[in-house]
């Protein structure tokens, strides 16, 4: 009867989740494998949060407000094994737009979710972030190493989007 | 004072060049963008070009993309719009722009007095 | 690319009065509490003037009888009181994502 009370809760939440999300991919997870976390196919997850890599090319407001119409935000970078995690799906020869921008020219960075900025937990490449006018950050691969650049916000470049995984 | 002089405009046939220069003065050129705007006679601004301050970015549209090339020399303050393939609808005055940057987009916020192309045979 | 449509294209203004121009964008041009339209003015055999930038931000030194307003896609320049030198071309123009446009333009004449 638990048992199946719980099927009944799950499959009412995928049908909710069905309208934003076509489909789901979900895996069993918990310390009895009996929660399920998703992610809307075809994103990938990693730890708490599900990413996909957008290849249009937009500006950075227009690629935030893409993520933002998905339900997501453009990526914020957390820990040095996101960071792997992420760009072991990108193409080297692109740039991708991080949820990381300096609206005024200050230097002042802020993430679009307000998570703060920490200094300590940044992946510059070496002599980044350079110019005031460039005030939108990707992420591209550079000297063997993949790493963030600051950008002007205008010139259309890839994304990335990250969401927080959906448990039912 | 800032100004912003441009030169080279002048009659020319369809399919020829010609190369507009505008000299800067009176702020740090090496540190703005810079642009070409044209205006066709009796008609709006249209942007032509666009380079970064490092001269890392160029842009064009579609209709002068693969024929005009935008260039800049920060030691000797000056910009340049090299026009290959010119057409009778390159005709305009051609104005360089300062770019000032305003949180995700820009301004012109100076503009020079303009150099007139005409293109006819 | 992002249209700008300005309307009225000619408006006839007396002195004294207050004229509206309005510019309507093909897609959003805000981003939060940035709004990103701007403002120029040319008269006659000169070049464009910045007038206003980030939709409601008066350029030093211009009149303050010039005030923008506006957000998303629907951006108003506005002139109170009207002076007989601010016979015009006035173009509206964004530049959130490359290419930058202006609008066609609204020819404001004094009566």
């Known amino acids: 009867n638990f048992m199946y009370s719980k099927t009944v809760k799950r499959l009412s939440k995928l049908q909710e989740y069905q309208q934003y999300y076509p489909s789901l991919t979900c895996v069993m997870e918990g310390k009895d494998m009996e929660d399920w976390s998703c992610c809307p196919t075809p994103w990938t997850s990693f730890q708490s949060s599900c990413y996909f890599i957008s290849t249009v090319m937009q500006s950075w407001t227009k690629s935030q407000n893409n993520c933002s119409v998905m339900g997501a935000d453009l990526v914020v970078i957390n820990t040095k094994e996101e960071q792997d995690f992420i760009t072991q799906n990108l193409k080297i020869n692109s740039a991708y737009f991080l949820g990381l921008s300096d609206p005024k020219g200050w230097r002042h960075w802020q993430w679009v979710d307000q998570t703060p900025y920490n200094k300590n937990v940044t992946f510059w490449h070496s002599g980044e972030p350079n110019s005031p006018d460039e005030r939108c950050a990707i992420i591209n691969f550079r000297s063997e190493e993949w790493g963030w650049n600051d950008v002007h916000c205008h010139v259309p470049q890839k994304s990335i989007c990250k969401m927080k995984k959906i448990y039912i | 004072e800032v100004q912003l002089v441009e030169s080279g405009g002048g009659l020319v046939k369809p399919g020829g060049s010609l190369r507009l220069s505008c000299a800067a003065s009176g702020f740090t050129f090496s540190s703005y963008g810079m642009s070409w705007v044209r205006q066709a006679p009796g008609k709006g601004l249209e942007w032509v070009s666009t380079i970064s301050s490092g001269d890392s970015y160029t842009y064009y549209p579609d209709s002068v993309k693969g024929r005009f090339t935008i260039s800049r020399d920060n030691a000797k303050n000056s910009l340049y719009l090299q026009m290959n393939s010119l057409r009778a609808e390159d005709t305009a005055v051609y104005y360089c722009a300062r770019q000032i940057y305003y949180d995700y987009a820009y301004y012109f916020d100076f503009w020079g007095q303009g150099t007139t192309v005409t293109v006819s045979s | 690319d992002i249209v700008l449509t300005q309307s009225p294209a000619s408006l006839a203004v007396s002195p004294g009065q207050r004229a509206t121009i309005t510019c309507r964008a093909s897609?959003?041009?805000?981003?939060?509490?940035?709004?990103?339209m701007h403002w120029y003015q040319q008269k006659p055999g000169q070049p464009p003037k910045l007038l206003i930038y980030?939709?409601?931000n008066l350029e030093s030194g211009v009149p303050a009888r010039f005030s923008g307003s506006g957000s998303e896609t629907d951006f108003t320049l506005t002139i109170n009181p009207v002076e007989a030198e601010d016979t015009a071309n006035y173009y509206c123009q964004q530049s959130i994502e490359d290419p930058p446009t202006f609008g066609g333009g609204t020819k404001v004449e004094i009566k």
């Open positions: 897609e959003s041009v805000s981003f939060r509490t940035s709004h990103l």
């Open positions: 980030g939709a409601s």
